[in-house]
Interface confidence: low
């Protein structure tokens, strides 16, 4: 009589997480009578996966009906595979007894699990930086298998080269994680820019996953200031304007000083947006030239996004003609006394 053989035809099987795996096993004889069991791993610590005779194995089913006469196929389906199911599976024939006696084992089938990486999450710097500075963006994706993975960075569609990537763990594992840090040099035009982290993996079938971050969250474009005066129709008044240009983000506090003394403070409200995403704003004062003292300096001081204030000063220019229009009795503050003292637009 030919000796019973337990045949596991595949040395290895690869399955995508969430799918079912089929592990094939046939025996060459139904004699002697006794159950077939499936284990993961070998030796005393092996894990019982399926017992034909008894037990409840909700994810494991036999491919063919093991109770059918002359059925020698003891292949199993394992449903809803996860990376934790990876390992070597053995089909083992037992001789019926009390207890059942192990008779013969198959050579084993290694189950490797292909698991999709999670959607990449891109995080930017905690504090904003100004143009010409370098900021770091981090991209993370988890839970993939096998370990081989490709990660690329793009800024506005252009591939970046300054980045470092690590895949963990270094050794064998059921699943892996990737972390990559890219360094991006900011420019004044980056308010509308975007960085993209792209992850390609065998499970994604050529359709990579992408994570994005907007540079608008990372950039601060400081304003440029310009102060100038214009005459008004009333001959004893001039308009002094502070033009605040090309700043981002919007948060801005403007203070007017007269010879170093605070005269009024405004928060930027009605802004105009530039094509590059930066903003412009202007604030103006009506100045009574008849109330001047010689050498009045008006200063426009701007605190942008909580940064140290920047300022621009302007010495009030009063023409001889304007001086002539003023009566000798005129006195009082330089700024027009009507409220509000200034205006913006």
């Amino acid at each position: 009589e030919e000796e019973l053989q337990v045949i596991q035809p595949e040395k290895s099987v690869s399955v995508t997480a969430g799918e079912s795996a089929t592990l094939n096993c046939t025996v060459t004889s139904l004699i002697p009578v006794g159950p077939i069991q499936w284990f993961r791993g070998a030796g005393p610590g092996r894990e019982l996966i399926y017992n034909l005779k008894e037990g409840h194995f909700p994810r494991v089913t036999t491919v063919l009906d093991p109770t059918k006469r002359n059925n020698m196929d003891f292949s199993i389906h394992i449903s809803n595979i996860t990376p934790a199911d990876a390992g070597t599976y053995y089909c083992v024939k037992f001789r019926k007894g009390s207890p059942d006696v192990e008779l013969k084992s198959g050579a084993g089938t290694e189950l490797s699990v292909r698991a999709k990486p999670s959607a990449p999450v891109v995080s930017g710097p905690t504090a904003r930086a100004t143009p010409e500075h370098t900021v770091s963006f981090t991209c993370e994706s988890h839970g993939f298998s096998p370990r081989d993975i490709t990660l690329k960075w793009f800024k506005n569609g252009n591939e970046l080269s300054d980045f470092q990537t690590n895949v963990d763990p270094a050794g064998k594992s059921v699943s892996y994680s990737i972390r990559s840090t890219a360094r991006v040099v900011l420019t004044r035009r980056d308010v509308h820019s975007q960085v993209i982290c792209e992850v390609a993996h065998v499970t994604l079938q050529g359709d990579p996953l992408r994570g994005t971050a907007n540079l608008s969250e990372a950039i601060r474009v400081p304003p440029t200031l310009e102060v100038f005066q214009r005459p008004m129709r009333a001959e004893n008044q001039v308009n002094v304007t502070c033009q605040v240009r090309k700043f981002y983000p919007q948060r801005l506090l403007l203070t007017w000083l007269e010879n170093g003394n605070v005269s009024q403070t405004e928060t930027a409200s009605t802004l105009t947006e530039n094509k590059d995403g930066t903003y412009n704003w202007r604030s103006w004062l009506l100045v009574n030239t008849c109330a001047h003292r010689d050498g009045v300096v008006l200063t426009c001081q701007v605190e942008h996004d909580g940064q140290p204030a920047v300022s621009k000063s302007h010495a009030l220019e009063v023409s001889a003609h304007q001086k002539e229009q003023c009566s000798d009795t005129t006195s009082g503050p330089v700024l027009a006394p009507t409220a509000p003292l200034g205006g913006s637009g």
Epitope: T61, V63, L64, D65, P66, T67, K68, R69
Partner: antibody, heavy 118, light 107 residues
Framework: EVQLVESGGGLVQPGGSLRLSCAAS????????MHWVRQATGKGLEWVSA???????YYTGSVKGRFTISRENAKNSLYLQMNSLRASDTAVYYC????????????WGQGTMVTVSS | DIQMTQSPSSLSASVGDRVTITCRAS??????LAWFQQKPGKAPKSLIY???SLHSGVPSKFSGSGSGTDFTLTISSLQPEDFATYYC?????????FGQGTKLEIK
């Protein structure tokens, strides 16, 4: 969508023949054990025949030698050739899919009526 | 052949009731027992396999138990759509055999 659609039923005289067909869609028929089950009007269910994935065939005693179950993989179809028909074969015939692992019935067709009468 | 006997043959119950149908096999069939529901003029619908496992899409108000020769189907809270005929079936060996059916009617 997984579906079974039977056809080929009708009125036939005793001793006559009829061939029932079952068209499968949404799955590969050859990967499953397939069955025919019948039900006479007002009566219970009766298993008639089965074909295994290896082509092995099984029949209930009353139809052995008269009925033949077969399948055509290219057409993803199951057949029941019924010869020497008797009045007692009058019933609605259902095509049924056996579960992939333990042959538990999971998918049923809508049935086709076979009437054997003179 | 393995004989399958269902009891009762018919049963009257009200909406909201909990009902139990039993099925006995003439010999040990392990847990290779299925339950089906059939409404007039319709094909049977698979409810339970291997004595206690619910087919996909079957509401959890249906439950099955048993092993060997004695099995039960329980419907925890009857709804109008549950009034139908129920069949048990053994599929441990050919020829597969069905119980004679239990007709569940509205009281």
């Amino acid at each position: 969508e997984v579906q079974l659609v039977e056809s080929g039923g009708g009125l036939v005289q005793p001793g006559g023949s009829l061939r029932l067909s079952c068209a499968a869609s949404g799955f590969t028929l050859s990967s499953y054990d397939m069955h025919w089950v019948r039900q006479a009007t007002g009566k219970g269910l009766e298993w008639v025949s089965a074909i295994g994935t290896a082509g092995d065939t099984y029949y209930t005693g009353s139809v052995k030698g008269r009925f033949t179950i077969s399948r055509e993989n290219a057409k993803n179809s199951l057949y029941l050739q019924m010869n020497s028909l008797r009045a007692s074969d009058t019933a609605v015939y259902y095509c049924v899919r056996g579960g992939v692992w333990d042959d538990a019935f999971d998918i049923w067709g809508q049935g086709t009526m076979v009437t054997v009468s003179s | 052949d393995i004989q399958m006997t269902q009891s009762p043959s018919s049963l009257s119950a009200s909406v909201g009731d909990r009902v139990t149908i039993t099925c006995r096999a003439s010999q040990d069939i392990n847990n290779y027992l299925a339950w089906f529901q059939q409404k007039p003029g319709k094909a049977p619908k698979s409810l339970i396999y291997t004595a206690s496992s619910l087919h996909s899409g079957v509401p959890s108000k249906f439950s099955g138990s048993g092993s060997g020769t004695d099995f039960t189907l329980t419907i925890s809270s009857l709804q109008p759509e549950d009034f139908a005929t129920y069949y048990c079936q053994q599929y441990v060996s050919y020829p597969y055999t069905f119980g004679q059916g239990t007709k569940l009617e509205i009281k």
